[in-house]
């Protein structure tokens, strides 16, 4: 199968949520863990993760299509100790399959702003702490 | 129809270096990983370690110093090495899909 | 390293029964346990993934439960073809270590 994984973000007032997003079959996402690292250029695992999430097969789903499922990281205040590197990752041990995302990077300013970086989905996002807004 | 297969010498002297050949067919290398396990004669089961979908690998810390796993993709071939055997390596090998499919094994006795 | 013990190392039951192997780790490894199925001269075969999930093709008279650090395998209605040596695998970390296994004999 074509399995594959990527990395978005979405800001809500002043919550900034990290999204990794796997796209699927349904018969193929049983055994899988998404994950998120941070500051974890070589070992990212589910151990060393900031969140994961274990994929389950809905049953509820109908047709062979491809579906996503998501996990989500929220980050309720950014603030200088969340600037680093992240990654999303799946791994499935059952079927020795993983997947590796982009790194992306927060970086918090001076300002009391902070940007993300390296997003492929979205490409350059950059938020505004103070305004709230995405600019 | 996923299929496994193992391949090596046999016999190896003490001190020498193990190499076995798993070539599989029904997928791709680069779709699925491999792991190799090991079975003492009459014992339990041992994790050795896994080359992914995309190449990387990870080893059991306690065989790291002397094992390596590596493929050639086009020819749909794994291969393990591990140096320095001793008697009580001898055991049958495995390699395995994941850890859905198996291998029927390859036979090692280190012997001299 | 999470060590697996596995219980009872060996045990008999009469066609029809229902039997149950127990795997106990040594610390919580969050359900990610497999069940094999050993037969003399033959590989493992995969029975059950994540605690509980049935592999395609394998009956469903064989079912696991379990959370944390207890795990269990029950075998249904036990048919002949099922005397083997069954194995827990936990893959919840490196490295991935199994039980010492259970010999099942059908009298």
């Known amino acids: 199968g074509c399995i594959n994984i990527t990395s978005s973000a979405s800001q809500e007032g002043t919550r900034l949520n990290l999204i990794c997003t796997v796209w699927h079959k349904k018969e193929e996402a049983e055994g899988f863990v998404v994950f998120l690292c941070k500051d974890r250029s070589g070992d990212c695992s589910p151990e060393t993760s900031l969140k994961q999430l274990r994929l389950k097969r809905d049953p509820g789903i109908d047709g062979v299509g491809e579906i996503s499922s998501q996990l989500m990281f929220t980050i309720s205040q950014v603030t200088p100790l969340h600037s680093g590197t992240y990654q999303c990752c799946a791994r499935s041990q059952k079927s020795g399959i993983r997947l590796q995302g982009h790194f992306f990077s927060i970086l918090f300013t001076e300002t009391g702003n902070y940007t993300v970086t390296g997003l492929k989905q979205r490409q350059h996002l950059e938020f505004s702490h103070n305004e709230g807004t995405l600019s | 129809q996923v299929n496994l297969q193992e391949s090596g010498p046999g016999l190896v002297q003490p001190s020498e270096t193990l190499s076995l050949t798993c070539t599989v067919s029904?997928?791709?290398?680069?779709?699925?990983?491999i792991n190799w396990f090991r079975q003492p004669p009459g014992k339990g089961l041992e994790w050795m370690g896994t080359?992914?979908?995309?190449?990387?690998?990870d080893y059991n810390s306690a065989l790291k110093s002397r094992l390596t796993i590596s493929r050639d993709t086009s020819k749909s071939q794994v291969f393990l090495k591990m140096n320095s055997l001793q008697t009580e390596d001898t055991a049958i090998y495995f390699c395995?899909?994941?850890?859905?499919?198996w291998g029927q094994g390859a036979s090692v006795t280190v012997s001299s | 390293d999470i060590r697996m013990t596995q219980s009872p190392a060996s045990l008999s039951a009469s066609l029809g029964e229902t039997v149950s192997i127990e795997c106990l780790a040594s610390?919580?490894?969050?359900?990610?346990l497999a069940w094999y199925q050993q037969k003399p001269g033959k590989s493992p075969q995969l029975l059950i993934y994540?605690?509980?999930s049935l592999q395609d093709g394998v009956p469903s008279r064989f079912s696991g439960s379990g959370s944390g650090t207890q795990y269990s395998l029950k075998i249904n209605s036990l048919e002949s073809e099922d005397a083997a040596t069954y194995f827990c695998?936990?893959?919840?970390?490196?490295?991935?270590?199994f039980g010492s296994g259970t010999k099942l004999e059908i009298k």
């Open positions: 695998l936990q893959d919840s970390e490196y490295p991935l270590t």
């Open positions: 080359i992914w979908n995309d190449g990387g690998t």
């Open positions: 994540y605690a509980s």
């Open positions: 610390e919580d490894i969050y359900k990610n």
């Open positions: 029904g997928f791709s290398l680069t779709n699925y990983g």
């Open positions: 395995a899909r994941g850890m859905e499919a």
